[in-house]
């Protein structure tokens, strides 16, 4: 069964600045990643960022950098000030849209306990939603 | 209701310019590429530019370096500069709404460019 | 770029009959891939998305099928308002490729 996993990371120097990583582990041919804030895609989440293999990227402030990690992972550096500024229990949530498996999404979030910089091993999250 | 009304059709002679319009409304249209579409009447369709959210701008080889796509957010409003126009460029353009990656869902209703002289 | 085949370019049909469309990709687009109805005079309408999805408000006689490079558009049984020109519409590359168009006519 497919799976996606997601880390949430604050950088030390910034501690505005988050980095979000999110990965497919599955066979099929990833053709849509999506990233949102403040929970599902479609479900009362914010997209910050959408990444097409051929069409390129999308992305919305705070979104500074998102980028193709692998064939089948990302990466998206998020900075801000004020409203727009994530914190440290934000839910960052990755949908995958992979052929033909169809739509995988996994949330997560800030490790409660990590020091600035520092991360929980990007294991699997829990999968919230299969289409 | 989503809606996206183009405007700014018209006749122009060969080499003349014109500008389109399109008004949108009814969703957030920040968070969506725009496209133009047109159709040369009783013809196919055939895309002519794509614009994201933040700019980015895509050509058919055919209208590159004479049209230019452009976009107003704060106003919900889509454009395209049309310089250097030929007779092949009469058709019946349309504004078209899509969710980046997901296709084109909404379109507008046209508006009808004729080059002639 | 990629090139959509589409076939028939025409065909007639009485209400009640089934009809396929198909349209044929130069080049893997996996389903990015959606399927338009146009009536004379007026802007065309997606039926279907990511090659097999229905779009919302769109009677369930219609369905797409296939991925890669084979597409095909179904009407189970067709009704007197589906007589109209039916397009396909790859958007996985840039330039956006649209197929030639097939229209339905009355037998």
């Known amino acids: 069964t497919p799976e996606v996993w997601v880390q949430v990371r604050m950088e030390a120097t910034e501690l505005s600045s988050f980095t979000i990583r999110c990965g497919f582990l599955g066979s099929g041919s990833i053709s849509l990643v999506t990233v949102s804030w403040g929970g599902p895609n479609g479900a009362g989440g914010t997209t910050l960022a959408v990444l097409h293999p051929e069409r390129g990227i999308r992305q919305w402030a705070p979104a500074r950098q998102a980028r193709w990690e692998t064939q089948s992972s990302i990466s998206l550096i998020l900075e801000g000030s004020g409203a727009s500024s994530p914190c440290a229990n934000t839910t960052f949530c990755c949908k995958f849209a992979s052929f033909p498996e169809g739509s995988w999404e996994a949330c997560g979030s800030l490790p409660p306990s990590s020091d600035p910089g520092l991360s929980a091993p990007p294991t699997p999250a829990p999968i919230l939603r299969a289409d | 209701e989503v809606q996206l009304v183009e405007s700014g059709g018209g006749l122009v002679q060969p080499g003349g310019s014109l500008r389109l319009s399109c008004a949108a409304s009814?969703?957030?249209?920040?968070?969506?590429?725009m496209h133009w579409v047109r159709q040369v009447p009783g013809k196919g369709l055939e895309w002519v530019s794509d614009?994201?959210?933040?700019?980015?701008?895509y050509y058919l080889g055919s209208v590159k370096g004479r049209f230019t796509i452009s976009r107003e957010n704060a106003k919900n409003s889509l454009y395209l500069q049309m310089n250097s126009l030929r007779a092949g460029d009469t058709a019946v353009y349309y504004c078209?709404?899509?969710?980046f990656g997901n296709g084109m869902d909404v379109w507008g209703q046209g508006t009808t460019v004729t080059v002639s002289s | 770029d990629i090139q959509m085949t589409q076939s028939p370019s025409s065909l007639s049909a009485s209400v009640g009959d089934r009809v396929t469309i198909t349209c044929r990709a130069s080049?893997?687009?996996?389903?990015?891939l959606g399927w338009y109805q146009q009536k004379p005079g007026k802007a065309p309408k997606r039926l279907i998305y990511?090659?097999?999805s229905l779009q919302s408000g769109v009677p369930s006689r219609f369905s797409g099928s296939g991925s890669g490079t084979e597409f095909t558009l179904t009407i189970s049984s067709l009704q007197p308002e589906d007589f109209a020109t039916y397009y396909c519409?790859?958007?996985?590359?840039?330039?956006?490729?649209f197929g030639g168009g097939t229209k339905v006519e009355i037998k």
């Open positions: 080049q893997g687009i996996r389903n990015d």
């Open positions: 614009i994201g959210n933040s700019g980015e701008t």
């Open positions: 990511a090659a097999s």
């Open positions: 078209v709404r899509e969710e």
């Open positions: 519409l790859q958007h996985n590359n840039y330039p956006l490729t």
């Open positions: 009814g969703f957030t249209f920040r968070n969506y590429d």
